[in-house]
């Protein structure tokens, strides 16, 4: 890989676990300024594999609120507005990083945690297993 | 909201920006042990709104590699295997948190950053505007 020289202005770390424990500035920089504000706003309702959004709250996690998608149907909505069970609605999942307070209830100490969230649903052709 | 008492075993912070700057342990705890490892593995190909995955790499970011979905078609795949433009493939986007090295090239100092990523695609009914 590319070796990038260390910036001489980096803060020192006297933590014995360095570089596993790092300093993180929580003033979030938002890179999304140029994105289309409409984004996925109403896709959950207009999709052929519609979903509901459920609030998942955990004060020991940062961010404390995460929205989880749950597909409304097992099948997909066809042109007549009916659920077609020849197709399947499935959740699209993504692993994301969150910060978990560690030790618990500490305001200034966290551990990185990987969690799996469902972001929305998509309609897929089912894998059909025929009986011999 | 619920007030949780501070744990007396929390580390002290002498940083003047506290609580904006916190300590984070990068030994990731993975909560996904019970998830189906196949997960969304082949949905990108079986979906009626299929997508390709593009690798986005940035050594100044943690995680340095993020996969971005790009919908393959404007329309959706119908039962005949044709792309149907009466329906629209659209990306499902999600805001995620990443760590950005700050100052640049520093191994132990980061800032939280919010970025928008496309996770997959879904098929939606278009909003049709006819000319009067």
């Amino acid at each position: 890989g590319i070796t990038i020289p260390r910036n001489p202005g980096c803060p020192n770390s006297e933590d014995k676990n360095f570089p596993r424990t790092v300093m993180v500035n929580l003033n979030i920089h938002n890179r999304n300024t140029n994105t289309n504000p409409k984004r996925s706003s109403d896709y959950y309702n207009r999709s052929t594999s519609p979903w509901n959004l459920h609030r998942n709250e955990d004060p020991e996690r940062y961010p404390s609120v995460i929205w989880e998608a749950k597909c409304r149907h097992l099948g997909c909505i066809n042109a007549d507005g009916n659920v077609d069970y020849h197709m399947n609605s499935v959740p699209i999942q993504q692993e994301i990083l969150v910060l978990r307070r560690e030790p618990p209830h500490c305001p200034n100490s966290f551990r990185l945690e990987k969690i799996l969230v469902s972001v929305g649903c998509t309609c897929v052709t089912p894998i059909v297993h025929h009986v011999a | 909201g619920i007030t949780i008492p501070r744990n007396p075993g929390c580390p002290n912070s002498e940083d003047k920006n506290f609580p904006r700057t916190v300590m984070v342990n990068l030994n990731i705890h993975n909560r996904n042990t019970n998830t189906n490892p196949k997960r969304s593995s082949d949905y990108y190909n079986r979906s009626t709104s299929p997508w390709n995955l593009h690798r986005n790499e940035d050594p100044e970011r943690y995680p340095s590699v993020i996969w971005e979905a790009k919908c393959r078609h404007l329309g959706c795949i119908n039962a005949d295997g044709n792309v149907d433009y009466h329906m629209n493939s659209v990306p499902i986007q999600q805001e995620i948190l990443v760590l950005r090295r700050e100052p640049p090239h520093c191994p132990n100092s980061f800032r939280l950053e919010k970025i928008l990523v496309s996770v997959g695609c879904t098929c939606v009914t278009p909003i049709v505007h006819h000319v009067a």
Partner: antibody, heavy 119, light 111 residues
Framework: QVQLKESGPGLVAPSQSLSITCTVS????????VHWIRQPPGKGLEWLVV???????TYNSALKSRLSITKDNSKSQVFLKMNSLQTDDTAMYYC?????????????WGQGTSVTVSS | DVVMTQTPLSLPVSLGDQASFSCRSS???????????LHWYLQKPGQSPKLLIY???NRFSGVPDRFSGSGSGTDFTLKISRVEAEDLGVYFC????????FGGGTKLEIK
């Protein structure tokens, strides 16, 4: 560099079928889609069909029952078959590359092959 | 299918003048993903069409900056700031938000 070259019979009798081949170079059919477009003498362009890199297709609905598109990725060839030709199918037939993102535009075109339907 | 209407049919201009081509669609070309798939092509006499502008306003590689595209929804314009002799030919607009269709073309000729 990117090139597309159409080859066809030139003359087709009414009610017969037409088969045209588009041979491409400078890019792979596993990465790019290919469109067929035609242009009757002195007239505008009419889009016919596209075959995408993943093998899916989209047809002009008015002509769908008469058209068939296939490809051979290893030979870098795309094939168009059109049935039941009539005199108004006389046109220059072009193949064109889709610009890589599946839905933007046709960035490179062949020089076309002239097809005359006549007895 | 979406009908693309181009005006005028013929556009006589003097070399060095500005030329403006209009294209109107029978329904909005804004896709659910927020993009607008409206493109412009030039077909010179005896040649196949060449891509000039894609997605309303993006110049294709090698296209001079005297060509510019604008518009939204259903109304679009292609402008040539200073017409040169090599610009003569028929200009077609095309949409690919829906099943692709082309306009009838506008012929650019010298006054």
């Amino acid at each position: 560099q990117v090139q597309l070259k159409e080859s066809g019979p030139g003359l087709v009798a009414p009610s017969q079928s037409l088969s045209i081949t588009c041979t491409v170079s400078g890019f792979s059919l596993t990465t790019y889609g290919v469109h067929w477009i035609r242009q009757p003498p002195g007239k505008g362009l009419e889009w016919l069909v596209v075959i995408w890199s993943d093998g899916y297709t989209t047809y002009n609905s008015a002509l769908k029952s008469r058209l068939s598109i296939t490809k051979d990725n290893s030979k870098s060839q795309v094939f168009l078959k059109m049935n039941s030709l009539q005199t108004d199918d006389t046109a220059m037939y072009y193949c064109a590359r889709n610009d890589g993102d599946y839905f933007y535009s046709m960035d490179y075109w062949g020089q076309g092959t002239s097809v005359t339907v006549s007895s | 299918d979406v009908v693309m209407t181009q005006t005028p049919l013929s556009l006589p201009v003097s070399l060095g003048d500005q030329a403006s081509f209009s294209c109107r669609s029978s329904q909005s070309l804004v896709h659910s993903n927020g993009n607008t798939y409206l493109h412009w092509y030039l077909q010179k006499p005896g040649q196949s069409p060449k891509l000039l502008i894609y997605k309303v306003s993006n110049r294709f590689s090698g296209v001079p900056d005297r060509f510019s595209g604008s518009g939204s929804g259903t109304d679009f314009t292609l402008k040539i700031s200073r017409v040169e002799a090599e610009d003569l030919g028929v200009y077609f607009c095309s949409q690919s938000t829906h099943v692709p269709t082309f306009g009838g073309g506008t012929k650019l000729e010298i006054k």
